[in-house]
Every structure is written in C-alpha cells, then in structure tokens.
C-alpha cells in the first residue's frame, strides 16, 4: 500500500481466483483513543472499533472510502483505490491501446516545433467516473522540470456502437532550448482512477521524435502561360520554430486525383514552390517534415487544381 | 588559416554539401546497424544517449543562430556563438565566433573519427564478421575535415592488445552511431543556416 | 502537335539501350508521359509511366527499365535486354493521367538478337 | 491489376454491330479507354473515362460500363473500322492493356 495523496491510498493486488490479498492495517487521524468506530462509504454498517482498524483487501468491494467516527461525527477519511496486478502486469482496463506505432501504446505524444511544448492525448470508453492526473520531467534519476496543464476532454467519436473519448494535456519544459541535442528523454505519467480502480500509464520520448509539424500555410497556385502546368507556392507554418534556415523543413507535393485509385503524382522538394502537371478534377496537396530529422509528415494542406 | 578557400560547390558554402553527406552517411549507417543488430539492444529506446564530445567541444552552444542567443536555456554552459557575416569561402571576413563554431565541429569530426576507426580495428578482429563501418562514413567525415581545413594535432588511435568484449564493442558502437546522427543533425542545421547568412 | 522516338537499334542480349521521346507544338513538361511496347505480330504492353516526377512500371520492368524526363525529352532506359524484348517502343502523351493517351509517336524498332 | 478482353476476334458485316468486352480484376470504377490500331500504324485513342469519346471519333463508336465490366459497341460497322481493339484499365499503380480483339469486316 501506499500514499497516492493525502488520504488516498493505493493497495496493489496479484489479481487472481482466491488470492489471498493484502492486509492493510488503517489508522484513524485524531488525538481520540475510545470510542472510534469505521464504516464504509455511505454504509451505516459498522466494520470496527478502535484507533486503528485491520481489514483484508481481496476485491473491488473492500475498496472504498473508509471513515472513522466518534459519536456520529466523521473524524478522518481514507480512500482505498485497487490497482491490480494480473500474470505480473499491471492492468491497462481504463485507457485504449492505440496500436500506433506500435502495440501497448495507450499514450500517445506530439509536438508542432522544438521549443519543449508537447501535447499527449489517450482514449477510453469510459464515460463517468473517471478522473486523471499527469505528471511530467525530462530523466528520472535527475529530473528536470516539465509543467503540464489541466486534462480536458477534447474530442468525441463514436466507433460502431461505442462512444470513444479522447482526452488530452499539453506540457511545456520549464527551460528548453530549441537547438539542443536530447540526451535524457522526456517523461511522461498519468494516473487514472475509474471508480476505485487505479490504473498508471507512462511514456518516454526524446522532443525531436515526436515533431509533427503543422501544415504549410498560404498554399496558392499560378497557372503558367500556355501551359497545363501551374506554380504552386506555400509558406512555413506559423508554429514552426525560428529561424527557418536553422530549423528547416522538406516538403512533399502531391497532385491526386478526385478518386484514390487513379495514380498520385508526388514531388519532393526542400523548396517553398515547384512546378506540377495540374488536371481537371485534381487537388493539389503539400505536407511537411523536419528536413534533418526524419520525424512525422504533418497533414496534408490542400486546394483544388482549378 | 582557420577556414577553408576549397571550390565552391553549387552553394555558396562549399561545406553545406559535405554536411549533408554527412547526415546521410550517419542516418544509413545507424539503419544498417539496427538492422543488423537486432538483437542487441540498439534503438534509441534501449541504449544510453551517451556524448563523447561532451566538456570536450561546444558545438551547439558555440555555433546557436543568433535568434537563440536570447534564450538563455541555450547558453547555460557557454556563452558563444556565431555573427554570420563570412562563409567557408570568405575566410579573412569570418568572424571569431563563427571560426570558434567550425573549429568545435571539426574537433567533433576528429574525435568521431578516432573512436570509429579504433572500434572497426576491434570489430575486424571478431571471429563472427558480423558488422564493421564501410570507408563511406570514414570517407565523408575526412571530406568535411579537409573542407573546414583546420590545422590540428594528430590524435593518437587508440589500440589494445587484450581481446575486445565484441558484445560491448556491438554495444558501444550503437551508442557511438546514434550520437553520431545527433550531432550530424546539429552541424547541418549549422551549415545551412550558414548557407542563408 | 507530334512526338517521335528515336534510339532504336539492333542489340546483342545484355547491351543497354536508352530510347528518346521528343514532342513538336507542345511542352513534354505539362504532361504524363507513358512508354508503351508492341512485339511483332502481338498486343501492346504498358511499360511504365512519369508525371512530373513520379514514375510508376509495369512489375516486370520494374529494375530493367527506367523513365525519366527533362523538358525537352522523356527518356526510356533499359538494361540486361533479352531477345523477348524485341519490339516497336512507343512513347505517348496522357490526356489526363496514364490510360488516356491521345498522341501517339511512330514507334522505333528494339530489336535484340546475338 | 489483370484486363480480359473477349473476344479475340470478330466478323462483322457493313451496317452490323460488333460489341467488345472487357473485364478487370479489381474495381478500376472509370479509369478505361479504349483505342483502334492498324495494321503499320500507331494506336489512336476513341474513347477514355470508360464512356467519353474523343474529339473527332464518329458517334458509332459507344463506350459503357464501370468498376469491372466494360463494353465498347460499333453500331453500323463501316469497312474501315477493320482494325484491331484494345482496352487500357488503370490503377493506382499500376496501367494494363487487354490482349486485343481483331475486328474483321465482311
């Protein structure tokens, strides 16, 4: 067991038919010695007398909000939450493995430049009853600091006949310096509670592996004189850290068609412009990644090929 | 004589296409590592991201664009860098700063070069073969060094007579590659932001 | 508005051959250009196809066979030939993309004999 | 991506009409043209996007169909329509020609 924050505690169980569990011993914070009784959440059942109270902890129905009391006035709280531990591994019930990039990956991080702002979202079924809490530092052993922001919830799908909810915090490195070489990575935990369920979820990346760009902006096309081809022509986003010859990025130009079985015509440049076949019917599009540091393509900026 | 006079390529800055085959020499050469060394741990997610530079040069702190002098997360062990008023070409208008910068890059280059020419000298003697450095990566570090032309005291290559550990040397040259691609990703960022000045 | 291929010749197997395809009264550089064969006496076979820069082949000429342009000229290279690929080349023009191919040259004759 | 053309060859009398068939593997939804060669001459495209006739081809020339099925129809063949016709289906890697149909008129 131990110390969540005040008052609320975690009692870690091999989860498992008939496992013995853990015995946990709860101790009532006053200065009064008789008269304390314990009861669980809004049951007016008494489980015990004394200071101190001694219960085995096997299920989710041991778990709860314990309250000591003296003549019908609640002297302390305790919240017991379970975190089960099933084969030797952790549960990961609350949150969704997003399978990208690759399986186990319930938290996923990214950055639009270097300057050590980052977001990361997760996904989960589940709709009520659940709270999350992150913390963030760049090393372990020797942590540097990373401040990160309240959790919101920031979108909602539904998949078949589930509901999906993502939710999402950005963090920032308390001092970052946008050209520096990463040698610890950024950390990255998030505690989730369903219920009585306490569930933690890490992440560990370098800044440089998460970059995502955004898309380049100001996309605008030339016709050419007498001619099928045009001049397409796009800018830098906004967010994209300075100074773009410092900072620069390659692009990806593609011409597709209105339908995704005719053939893709791509071009890659280092350019803000290039010269390409438009068609009828066509969207031109262009995408974005660091030039040195083969991290994400951003999303695609698109107009029409008119 | 600090900087090169070498001829001029398509840039203006003769060492920004050097650079670049440099980048791509460093990034094939980790991905041909990894892919033969899979089952030693050398992803970026199971080695220590070591520096040999470290306390040794100041790469990114002596050549930071002037943009992010102001930043003073970015000066917190040295405070230099680089006025862009000169090129590799224009070497007598080259500031002190920017000399400081390419000298800092070449003594990373040299000192990459030593570690990697003493490491293939233990990886040829493994009985498996399994892996040691082609002459393009050797090759494109001593192009970039003649082309920043700095005169420099020869380091002695270092040399052991007891048989290496090839799992750690495996080990250490992972550690060595990654490193490597980072610092190859700085210097560059450097030479075309050169490039542009 | 016209093309015309040139290059073809009478090879030995394994020679490499590069064929040349030049347009009249239109530029080269605003369309798809597409290499096509035709075997004496058989049907036509698609080899492979540039946009602006993007090239897609035929599985089997994928390796053997490479398309590029500049913008004056669409070029078709070949390698390691074999008498199988004795055939008139030609080179067209893609109304839009690559199975549309509204200009047509005259063809020039590959033929690879030892 | 494969294209069966049937079939291989027909006859046709002057004033009959010939319909040719072709068939793709795969879904290639309007991306199908068909074309007309001579014997010693270049191929000359009649129709594209599956149903659109090109400039200056006579009206007798009928393409129809999409997604895997396609059929070009001559009404009222004239003599010099004896040629051979191929079908041209496209992916989005990759372009195929059908194995052809001779069409001989009587």
């Known amino acids: 067991i131990w110390e969540l924050k005040k008052d609320v505690y975690v009692v870690e169980l091999d989860w498992y038919p008939d496992a013995p569990g853990e015995m946990v011993v709860l101790t009532c914070d006053t200065p009064e010695e008789d008269g304390i009784t314990w009861t669980l959440d809004q049951s007016g059942e008494v489980l015990g007398s004394g200071k101190t109270l001694t219960i085995q902890v096997k299920e989710f129905g041991d778990a709860g909000q314990y309250t000591c009391h003296k003549g019908g006035e609640a002297l302390s709280h305790s919240l017991l939450l379970l975190h089960k531990k099933e084969d030797g591994i952790w549960s990961t019930d609350v949150l969704k493995d997003q399978k990208e990039p690759k399986n186990k990956t319930f938290l996923r991080c990214e950055a639009k430049n270097y300057s050590g702002r980052f977001t990361c979202w997760w996904l989960t079924t589940i709709s009520t009853d659940l709270t999350f809490s992150v913390k963030s530092s760049r090393g372990s052993s020797n942590p540097q600091g990373v401040t990160c922001g309240a959790v919101t919830l920031s979108a909602e799908r539904v998949r078949g006949d589930n509901k999906e909810y993502e939710y999402s915090v950005e963090c920032q490195e308390d001092s970052a310096c946008p050209a520096a070489e990463e040698r610890l990575p950024i950390e990255v935990m998030v505690d989730a509670i369903h219920k009585l369920k306490y569930e933690n979820y890490t992440s560990s990346f370098f800044i440089r592996d998460i970059i995502k760009p955004d898309p380049p902006k100001n996309l605008q096309l030339k016709p050419l004189k007498n001619s099928r081809q045009v001049e397409v022509s796009w800018e830098y986003p906004d967010t994209w850290s300075t100074p773009h010859s410092y900072f620069s990025l390659t692009f990806c130009i593609q011409v597709q068609g209105k339908s995704k079985r005719e053939k893709k015509d791509r071009i890659f440049t280092d350019k803000t412009s290039a010269t390409v076949i438009c068609r009828k019917n066509a969207s031109f599009s262009v995408q974005a990644q660091d030039r040195y540091y083969s991290s994400s393509w951003s999303e695609w900026a698109s107009v029409p090929c008119s | 004589r600090n900087l090169s006079v070498a001829t001029p390529g398509p840039e203006m800055f003769p060492c920004l296409h050097h650079s670049q085959n440099l980048l791509k020499a460093a990034s094939n050469t980790l991905q041909k590592a990894r892919q033969i060394l899979e089952f030693y741990p050398c992803t970026s997610e199971e080695i220590d991201h070591e520096d040999i530079t470290k306390d040794k040069t100041s790469t990114v702190e002596a050549c930071l664009p002037l943009e992010l002098i102001k930043n003073e997360s970015c000066l917190n062990s040295r405070e230099t860098s680089f006025i862009t008023n000169g090129s590799c070409l224009a070497s007598r208008k080259t500031s002190f700063m920017m000399a400081l910068c390419l000298r800092s890059i070449y003594e990373d280059l040299k000192m990459y070069q030593v570690e990697f020419k003493t490491m293939n000298a233990k990886l040829l003697r493994d009985p498996k073969r399994q892996i040691f450095l082609d002459q393009n990566i050797l090759g494109v570090i001593d192009e970039l060094m003649q082309a920043l032309n700095f005169n420099s005291e020869t380091v002695p290559q270092k040399s052991s007579l007891e048989e290496p550990d090839f799992y750690k040397t495996k080990i250490k040259l992972c550690i060595l590659l990654h490193a490597f691609r980072i610092r190859a990703v700085t210097i560059d960022r450097v030479m075309s932001y050169l490039n542009a000045s | 508005q016209s093309l015309e291929e040139s290059g073809g010749r009478l090879v030995t197997p394994g020679t490499p051959l590069t064929l040349t395809c030049t347009a009249s009264g239109f530029s080269l550089s605003s369309y798809w250009m597409t290499w096509v064969r035709q075997a004496p006496g058989g049907g036509l076979e698609w080899i492979g196809t540039?946009?602006?820069?993007s090239t897609y082949y035929a599985s089997w000429a994928k390796g053997r066979f490479t398309i590029s342009r500049t913008s004056t000229t669409v070029d078709l290279k070949m390698t390691s030939l074999t008498t199988e690929d004795t055939a008139t080349y030609f080179c067209?023009?893609?109304?839009?993309?690559?199975?549309?191919?509204?200009?047509w040259g005259p063809g020039t004759l590959v033929t690879v004999s030892s | 991506l494969v294209m069966t053309q049937t079939p291989a060859s027909v006859s046709a009398a002057v004033g009959g009409t010939v319909t040719i068939n072709c068939q793709a593997s795969?879904?290639?939804?309007?991306?199908l043209a068909w074309y007309q060669q001579k014997p010693g001459q270049r191929p000359k495209l009649l129709i594209y996007?599956?149903?659109t006739l090109t400039s200056g081809v006579p009206s007798r020339f009928k393409g129809s169909g999409s997604g895997k099925q396609f059929t070009l129809t001559i009404s009222g063949v004239q003599r010099e329509d004896a040629a051979t016709y191929y079908c041209l289906g496209a992916d989005d890697t990759t372009t195929v020609f059908g194995g052809g149909t001779k069409v001989v008129v009587v």
């Open positions: 540039i946009a602006t820069s």
């Open positions: 996007s599956a149903s």
């Open positions: 795969e879904d290639i939804e309007s991306y």
């Open positions: 067209a023009r893609g109304l839009t993309t690559d199975y549309d191919l509204d200009l």
